[in-house]
């Protein structure tokens, strides 16, 4: 809401998730694995990557189905805490300028910092508009303090904020899963809120920091070459 | 249990304006949009527009611009629909209905709407 | 405005028999579309959401298909119960919210 159209492939991290349709947003972290939302998550999904408009065969996409999808095994549906979930692609992405892997953060988000938030949500607060090319949107980082102000008791160390107190600019449906970059980092997963573009409302993302470990521990588990003793 | 009680028929002469209400009882009014639906005898449905209870904000049907007014009143969880300057072919039956989709503590993934709950309808008559 | 049309718009079943109602959209709506169920002298009901989803309460033998701008609803074993209108409705684009016209499946 409030964004912008993306320069096509200027987000070469950013991928689709199908299941015959757009559903969910996802970040590209390596050649064979996505992060998303936790509440992304489905039986069978679809990864589709370089990605802009996705009712279009542009050229530059790639179609790999998901051979495993891993949720965080600490997930609450109930509050959102712990909304993240890895996907193993089943083939290994071919890496070009188009398409290529977001970093992991080194440390944790700092309030007013400038982000790129991107995907193929619900562009209006009021009513649906669901568009066909990527969506971007910049946006600072907020303070726990003011993330905690605008939703009393529902934030966790594991959430932050980024947009707008006054409204106007936010994810929103169909954002799901998608990245919120800074310093080209992977600091956000778009996650909830209140509404979208509400005053005094703004989006909640999980703290990706917080997984880093999980991340790396999960995909060394779930790597063929690993040694068995 | 979930429901959507209407306000009862109204006959109306050209120019007037007719208020329907709809109250809701079994859930949180504040958390779903509240749309209003018409239906002309023998025709199919046509959306009027829709009302966000918690913010308020509305959205109308181009063709009801101007002369459509949707409010709520939150305290008494009640929904209305004001239609201005009737005309006879304003003759139908107007429902309420609630989309099922959960306004508040929204997670962002693409939401799949629907009118889950339709209330019984109101026959609005216009007649000279 | 996205255009939502319906076909046939009168489809003669014997109970029993398989329906199938079909529902165009004049753009891709992705799998943001319902199917209800109206009886005359009643609101409409919700059969299907999502494209094909079944609503809380909705014998299995409604079942709903399709994306993008195709959809089709499908009625496997018709009931006397079952005779009525259907009308789709996209919610990918509002607004305006718009329906088809309407399928009548009456007894043949």
């Known amino acids: 809401v409030g964004g912008y159209i993306c320069e096509e492939n200027s987000v070469p991290y950013q991928v689709s998730l199908n299941s015959g349709y757009h559903f969910c947003g996802g970040s590209l972290i390596s050649e064979q694995w996505v992060v998303s939302a936790g509440h992304c998550y489905k039986s069978r999904i679809q990864v589709r990557l370089g990605e802009h408009n996705i009712e279009v065969l542009e050229g530059n996409e790639q179609f790999i189905n998901a051979a495993k999808i891993i949720r965080h095994p600490k997930y609450n549906s109930r509050t959102l805490d712990n909304d993240i979930l890895l996907i193993k692609l089943s083939s290994p992405a071919v890496i070009n300028s188009r398409v290529s892997a977001i970093s992991l953060p080194t440390a944790p988000p700092a309030a007013g910092t400038e982000s790129l938030i991107s995907g193929w949500g619900n562009t209006l607060s009021s009513g649906a508009d669901y568009p066909d090319e990527l969506q971007c949107l910049d946006a600072p980082v907020l303070s726990q303090a003011e993330c905690e102000a605008s939703y009393p008791g529902k934030i966790t160390n594991n959430m932050f904020c980024v947009g707008f107190l006054e409204g106007g600019k936010d994810s929103c449906q169909g954002d799901a899963g998608g990245p919120v970059v800074s310093n080209g980092e992977l600091q956000g997963i778009v996650s909830w809120g209140y509404g979208c573009a509400q005053k005094n409302r703004p989006g909640v993302y999980t703290k990706v920091y917080n997984y880093v470990d999980w991340i790396k521990d999960t995909i060394a588990a779930n790597s063929h070459h690993h040694h068995h003793h | 249990q979930v429901q959507l009680v209407q306000s009862g028929a109204e006959v109306k002469k050209p120019g007037a304006s007719v208020k329907v209400s709809c109250k809701a009882s079994?859930?949180?009014?504040?958390?779903?949009?509240m749309h209003w639906v018409r239906q002309a005898p023998g025709q199919g449905l046509e959306w009027m527009g829709a009302?966000?209870?918690?913010?308020?904000?509305?959205n109308y049907a181009q063709k009801f611009q101007g002369r459509v007014t949707m409010t709520r009143d939150t305290s008494i969880s009640t929904a209305y629909m004001e239609l201005s300057r009737l005309r006879s072919d304003d003759t139908a039956v107007y429902y309420c209905?609630?989309?099922?989709?959960?306004?508040?503590?929204?997670?962002?993934?693409?939401?799949?709407?629907?009118?889950?709950?339709w209330g019984q309808g109101t026959t609005v008559t216009v007649s000279s | 405005e996205i255009v939502m049309t319906q076909s046939p718009a009168t489809l003669s079943v014997s109970p029993g028999e398989r329906a199938t109602l079909s529902c165009r959209a004049s753009?891709?709506?992705?799998?943001?579309l319902a199917w209800y169920q109206q009886k005359p002298g009643q609101a409409p009901r919700l059969l299907i959401y999502?494209?094909?989803t079944r609503a809380t309460g909705i014998p299995a033998r409604f079942s709903g298909s399709g994306s993008g701008t195709e959809f089709t609803l499908t009625i496997s074993s018709l009931q006397s119960e079952d005779f009525a209108v259907y009308y789709c409705?996209?919610?990918?684009?509002?607004?305006?919210?718009?329906f088809g016209g309407g399928t009548k499946v009456e007894i043949k």
């Open positions: 209905a609630r989309d099922f989709v959960l306004l508040l503590r929204q997670s962002r993934i693409l939401h799949e709407s629907a009118f889950d709950i």
């Open positions: 079994g859930y949180t009014f504040e958390g779903h949009y």
């Open positions: 009302i966000n209870p918690y913010s308020g904000q509305t």
């Open positions: 753009q891709s709506v992705g799998s943001n």
């Open positions: 999502g494209a094909s």
């Open positions: 409705q996209q919610f990918h684009n509002w607004p305006p919210l718009t």
